[in-house]
């Protein structure tokens, strides 16, 4: 359905608010060196454009695409050049090739300060004193560092900060009812940008089949008791709207999304059970919560479908005929009896189970050549069985912040070409796999470690290609999409890395360790053993064991001295001696 | 309300041609196997064959060349062209849905049938 | 095509009575064998899927049991709605399926 004017159909679809907050996201996530200013200046021009879009829609200008008047505003941005380097170079392009320079640009780690909490009482008064600067400053802030968050979802975050505030600054204790929101708000607003990351990464990288094969397995196992038609509807308006947002199109991406909230709640009878809680909320509230929705149980009479897809002599003629058909069925059957697997899993046997049919349906005898695919999915089936099995002892054996280091050591000697910062961030992540997905029954468990580990490989992924180091890293990450966490877990010691020369000012430490939250001092101590490993990747754990154990001590002995960084000065260089001793 | 419901029978002379329909609600037709079972007058079930989610269309070997079996899934409808009719095709029509879009049983949900009187 | 005999064709029993009807296959059929029960006037409903999984909603005297060629529909205890006419199908081979030839199940 076509609009005279794109900006003001979407201006009274989303309702001014929702618009703005919008085009915020879209210009903080393009220009992400730019001050808030900048883009609170630019955005109340494309707002008070829209308007008069609205009044007339034949006006000068309101006939342009969103891509051409965006792209048309952020080229007025007089440092361009000198903020943004070649980025300014996009501006002398048309479109369609202008909007993908800029997509091409965004950057996954910008080189911005991390965000400093300021007091609460000083929150609070920003807060009261101006909510609508207070609130857009957020949005600004969060979409900069996070290029490819889901917008709509970020509006959806912006709301629940702005309830925290205006509850909680009229509480007695206003730290105490505010700090815990704040950092559920930070620790699921990382995990919902990373999860999107992988989103886009699948469809920009692997195509949107890739993208779609995904969400047939996904939402086969959410809505089991959806038919095949209605959930590869499902997928194809998710597919457009995740298209739309991973492209930069956030009006367009955050109008469709409401038009799928809609459309599920209207038809939950065909859906899913579980859809009528979420229906009762308010839009961005509603959006969320389908998003998130808990398995439907499965329905009852299913049959075994080796009948259909192993036992039939017929499978070779159907698989001919209609072969995208044939395989997004076989994905959603076999989903949607498998709330227990991963979705990378559900993936590897749509897989296994094409290449099995390929290579049968050209033999002599097809079907004695494909009878037994479904034991040769066995092996597949155990491999994260056995990976999560293992992980999770490990896991209630060390607690968390030794099975993150055992992980350190273990991705470091894999992959010892990659930074430093970015093992520790990536391992510490991995991680915390442990507390997220251990404690869950059996049936949750591989899901849960899985399709996680596949999002934070993926982060290793993003960063690896700005600064690529290792082969076996683009290797794993380029290859195949669903076999990125099989690869990565193959990977053994890199026997041709050449050891990084021991520097002493890489393990030389102040005072100002003692200062430092547990967190932070975890992260040092995360660094070290990283360098550990890079200068002697044959360490033993034990050696490695020894010489962390020396480190905490030594830490912890300087921080209780009353001349602390005289104690570190002393004590570090036999620290670093003894450690180097250790490790020979 | 889940259903399937079967028309287009009644009196129809040997040699002559009929189309029976079968139109599904409450579900969407393009996910399943749609089959067609008959069954003479007090004798047994007799499958005639299916269209599947793919739109391939198999049938038993008596039913070859004179039984079509088509769909539209803009109107949710399953149909059964009957070509050179004979006094023993004589029987109510059922239509049934396949277990999911390639499966050839067991038939859960069942037509009431339509009865098709082959005579001169 | 295989083919699927069922037998006996005709049996009468009491209210209370264990009823068997067996259904033969002239090839393997893996464990893809299910049975219908029929009342006049009405189309067939399914009772057992796999040759053991019983439908839900369908009382637990019903079971079925074996698998390859030799396959039983057993009630345990014969109820008076359960006089009716029994069909097994057999299916998954290939993209055709088969049905036997019916038991019909009469108050002795």
């Known amino acids: 359905d076509t609009h005279k004017s794109e900006v003001a159909h979407r201006f009274k679809d989303l309702g001014e608010e929702h618009f703005k907050g919008l085009v915020l996201v879209a210009f903080s996530q393009y220009l992400q060196q730019c001050p808030f200013e900048e883009h609170v200046k630019l955005v109340n021009e494309v707002t008070e454009f829209a308007k008069t879009c609205v009044a007339d829609e034949s006006a000068e200008n309101c006939d342009k695409s969103l891509h051409t008047l965006f792209g048309d505003k952020l080229c007025t941005v007089a440092t361009l050049r000198e903020t943004y380097g070649e980025m300014a170079d996009c501006c002398a392009k048309q479109e369609p090739e202008r909007n993908e320079c800029f997509l091409q640009h965004k950057d996954d780690n910008p080189n911005l300060p991390p965000l400093v909490r300021p007091e609460v009482d000083v929150m609070c008064t920003a807060f009261h004193d101006n909510e609508a600067t207070f609130l857009k400053k957020y949005l600004y802030e969060v979409a900069r560092r996070h290029p490819y968050f889901y917008a709509p979802e970020l509006l959806f975050f912006a709301a629940r900060y702005k309830a925290a505030f205006a509850e909680c600054c009229q509480a007695a204790d206003k730290a105490a009812c505010l700090l815990p929101k704040l950092d559920e708000l930070r620790d699921e607003g990382k995990a919902s940008s990373a999860k999107q990351r992988l989103k886009c990464a699948s469809l920009q990288k692997f195509g949107d089949r890739a993208f779609k094969a995904w969400a047939v397995a996904r939402l086969s196992q959410k809505f089991p008791k959806a038919e095949f038609a209605e959930v590869s509807k499902l997928v194809t308006d998710l597919t457009k709207v995740h298209t739309e947002c991973c492209h930069g199109d956030l009006l367009e991406c955050a109008d469709d999304r409401a038009d799928l909230a809609k459309y599920m709640c209207e038809n939950q009878d065909s859906i899913s059970s579980k859809l009528k809680e979420c229906c009762d909320k308010p839009l961005l509230e509603k959006s969320h919560c389908l998003a998130e929705v808990e398995n439907d149980e499965m329905p009852a009479d299913l049959p075994s479908l080796a009948a259909d897809y192993v036992e039939s002599k017929d499978v070779c003629k159907n698989y001919a005929e209609a072969k995208d058909v044939f395989l997004g069925m076989f994905l959603y059957e076999y989903a949607r009896r498998h709330p227990d697997y991963s979705v990378m899993l559900l993936l590897r046997l749509a897989k296994a189970y094409e290449a099995t049919l390929e290579k049968c349906c050209a033999a002599a005898d097809p079907h004695e050549c494909y009878a037994k695919v479904f034991d040769e999915f066995q092996p597949l089936v155990e491999e994260p069985q056995n990976l999560v099995k293992q992980n999770c002892e490990l896991f209630e054996q060390l607690g968390e912040y030794k099975f993150q280091n055992a992980l350190l050591v273990r991705y470091t000697k894999k992959v010892p070409q990659v930074s430093t910062p970015t093992l520790v961030e990536v391992s510490r992540n991995l991680g915390k796999v442990g507390a997220k997905c251990c404690k869950l029954p059996e049936a949750k468990r591989m899901p849960c470690a899985e399709d996680y580990l596949s999002v934070v490989l993926n982060r290793l992924c993003v960063l690896h290609e700005k600064t690529p180091v290792s082969e076996k890293v683009t290797k794993c990450c380029t290859e195949s999409l669903v076999n990125r966490r099989p690869c990565f877990s193959a990977l053994e010691l890199d026997e041709a890395y050449v050891p990084k020369a021991f520097n002493a000012e890489t393990f030389t430490f102040h005072a100002d360790m003692c200062t430092l939250s547990e967190k932070e001092k975890q992260v040092k101590k995360q660094t070290a053993l990283v360098e550990l490993v890079k200068h002697k990747p044959k360490a033993t754990k034990e050696q490695l064991k020894g010489v962390m154990d020396n480190f905490a001590a030594f830490v912890e002995k300087c921080c209780k001295a009353d001349d602390k960084e005289a104690c570190f000065a002393e004590e570090g260089p036999k620290f670093v001696a003894a450690s180097q001793a250790a490790l020979a | 309300e889940v259903q399937l419901v079967e028309s287009g029978g009644g009196l129809v002379q040997p040699g002559g041609s009929l189309r029976l329909s079968c139109a599904a609600s409450?579900?969407?037709?393009?996910?399943?196997?749609m089959n067609w079972v008959r069954q003479a007058p007090g004798k047994g079930l007799e499958w005639i064959g299916h269209i599947n989610a793919g739109d391939i269309a198999y049938y038993a070997t008596w039913a070859k060349g004179r039984f079509t079996i088509s769909r539209d899934n803009s109107k949710n409808t399953v149909y059964l062209q009957m070509n050179s009719l004979r006094a023993e095709d004589t029987a109510v029509y059922f239509c049934?849905?396949?277990?999911?879009?390639?499966?050839?049983?067991?038939?859960?949900?069942w037509g009431q049938g339509t009865l098709v009187t082959v005579s001169s | 095509a295989f083919e699927l005999t069922q037998s006996p064709s005709s049996l009468s029993a009491s209210v209370g009575d264990r009823v068997t009807i067996t259904c033969q296959a002239s090839?393997?059929?893996?464990?893809?064998l299910a049975w219908y029960q029929q009342k006049p006037g009405q189309p067939p409903k399914l009772l057992i899927y796999d040759a053991s999984d019983l439908t839900s909603g369908v009382p637990s005297r019903f079971s079925g049991s074996g698998s390859g060629t030799d396959f039983t529909l057993t009630i345990s205890s014969l109820q008076p709605e359960d006089f009716a006419t029994y069909y097994c199908?057999?299916?998954?081979?290939?993209?055709?399926?088969?049905f036997g030839g019916g038991t019909k199940l009469t108050v002795l």
């Open positions: 409450g579900f969407s037709l393009s996910s399943y196997a």
């Open positions: 049934a849905r396949g277990a999911g879009g390639f499966s050839t049983g067991p038939f859960k949900l």
């Open positions: 090839e393997s059929i893996n464990s893809r």
């Open positions: 199908q057999g299916y998954g081979g290939s993209s055709t399926t088969t």
